[in-house]
């Protein structure tokens, strides 16, 4: 999918309003110097791009993500404010169903999500550039 | 099952508020955004706008954007739509309709409409 | 925003005859369109999603196909139960709009 026509001021808005303070609550108990960033993004389709793919694609080592509540309100504002995205959904959607694993937070999920919030901060950094 | 309940019909004066109810069950009501949308007599459908509560944010058509509030309470699963400055034009049967925010993404149930006469 | 202009306005046909329904956007929105059909008195009931995806309890009379700015709503055969209005939707951006309608009516 193509991020490039997203509403990027609503999808800052959400992520400030409510997405970070989930990733955060995730987070709680670690140092935000535990982990370091090893993902980074160029510019706002780029950020989206890897964010969803930190978010939704499961890795060998945490493939729990995407049932957490930052992961579906991240997918409700793409599908909200980037044309189109919703479509690209429905089957994956169904996908995932199928997939449903147990939910377990590991040392490797808490790194993902670390990395997602770096990715976060990238995209809010790259927002203000523009403006 | 689904069921979408709305307020009853209502008669208003120009210049005037009207705030119709849209009660869901049966379903987790924040994993759906609430759509309204409303149809003039002998007319088609025109969307006015939603409320995501997962979200807690709302959209709105530019036509209606300052005299249309949408807004939900989540601990009653109600979704409500506040239309101001009403004039003849907004006589219309307003509908409330869900839409899933992270499956589905349409509108696969409505409720049974609601009525709003404008008249002095 | 993006316009749907549905065509015919009207269609008049009898009972067991086949009636293709048009959608055309005013942009390409790739597959994001669906179909209601509404009745008197009654709130629109959703046919189709996506273009193509049937929905359960909608009989397989129904059937949907197009991407881009071109959908098509198909009743293989018409029953009594299927004149009404028919409208297309669209859900690929902000705001939605929906078709101007075409009735289905008796011949």
């Known amino acids: 999918y193509d991020f490039t026509n997203c509403d990027f001021q609503k999808i800052e808005a959400d992520y400030l309003r409510t997405i970070s303070k989930d990733l955060i609550t995730y987070m709680s108990g670690t140092k935000s110097t535990d982990f370091n960033n090893t993902v980074s993004c160029s510019n706002r389709p780029h950020c989206l791009t890897e964010i969803q793919s930190l978010t939704f694609n499961p890795t060998p080592r945490c493939a729990s993500l995407a049932k957490e509540m930052f992961a579906r309100k991240t997918k409700a504002t793409l599908a909200l404010w980037c044309p189109g995205y919703s479509e690209t959904q429905i089957n994956a959607t169904q996908a995932m169903k199928k997939r449903r694993k147990r939910k377990v937070t590991t040392n490797k999920c808490l790194e993902q999500v670390s990395q997602l919030l770096g990715l976060w901060r990238r995209f809010i950094r790259t927002l203000l550039k523009k403006q | 099952q689904v069921q979408l309940v709305q307020s009853g019909p209502e008669v208003k004066k120009p210049g005037s508020s009207v705030k119709v109810s849209c009660k869901a069950s049966?379903?987790?009501?924040?994993?759906?955004?609430m759509h309204w949308v409303r149809q003039r007599p002998g007319q088609g459908l025109e969307w006015m706008g939603t409320?995501?509560?997962?979200?807690?944010?709302?959209d709105y058509n530019q036509n209606f954007k300052g005299r249309a509030t949408i807004t939900a309470d989540k601990s009653t699963s109600t979704a409500y739509m506040e239309l101001s400055s009403l004039r003849s034009e907004d006589t219309a049967v307003y509908y409330c309709?869900?839409?899933?925010?992270?499956?589905?993404?349409?509108?696969?149930?409505w409720g049974q409409g609601t009525l709003v006469t404008v008249s002095s | 925003e993006i316009v749907l202009t549905q065509s015919p306005g009207t269609l008049s046909l009898s009972p067991g005859e086949r009636a293709t329904l048009s959608c055309r956007a005013s942009?390409?929105?790739?597959?994001?369109v669906h179909w209601y059909q509404q009745k008197p008195g009654e709130a629109p009931r959703l046919l189709i999603y996506?273009?193509?995806q049937s929905i359960s309890g909608i009989p397989d009379r129904f059937s949907g196909s197009g991407s881009g700015t071109d959908f098509t709503l198909t009743i293989s055969r018409l029953e009594s139960e299927d004149f009404a209005v028919y409208y297309c939707?669209?859900?690929?951006?902000?705001?939605?709009?929906f078709g101007t309608g075409t009735k289905v009516e008796i011949k």
């Open positions: 309709a869900r839409m899933g925010v992270t499956h589905s993404y349409v509108m696969d149930a």
């Open positions: 049966g379903y987790i009501f924040t994993d759906y955004a």
């Open positions: 409320f995501i509560p997962l979200l807690d944010t709302s």
């Open positions: 942009q390409p929105i790739s597959i994001s």
């Open positions: 996506f273009a193509s």
């Open positions: 939707q669209q859900t690929f951006s902000l705001p939605y709009t």
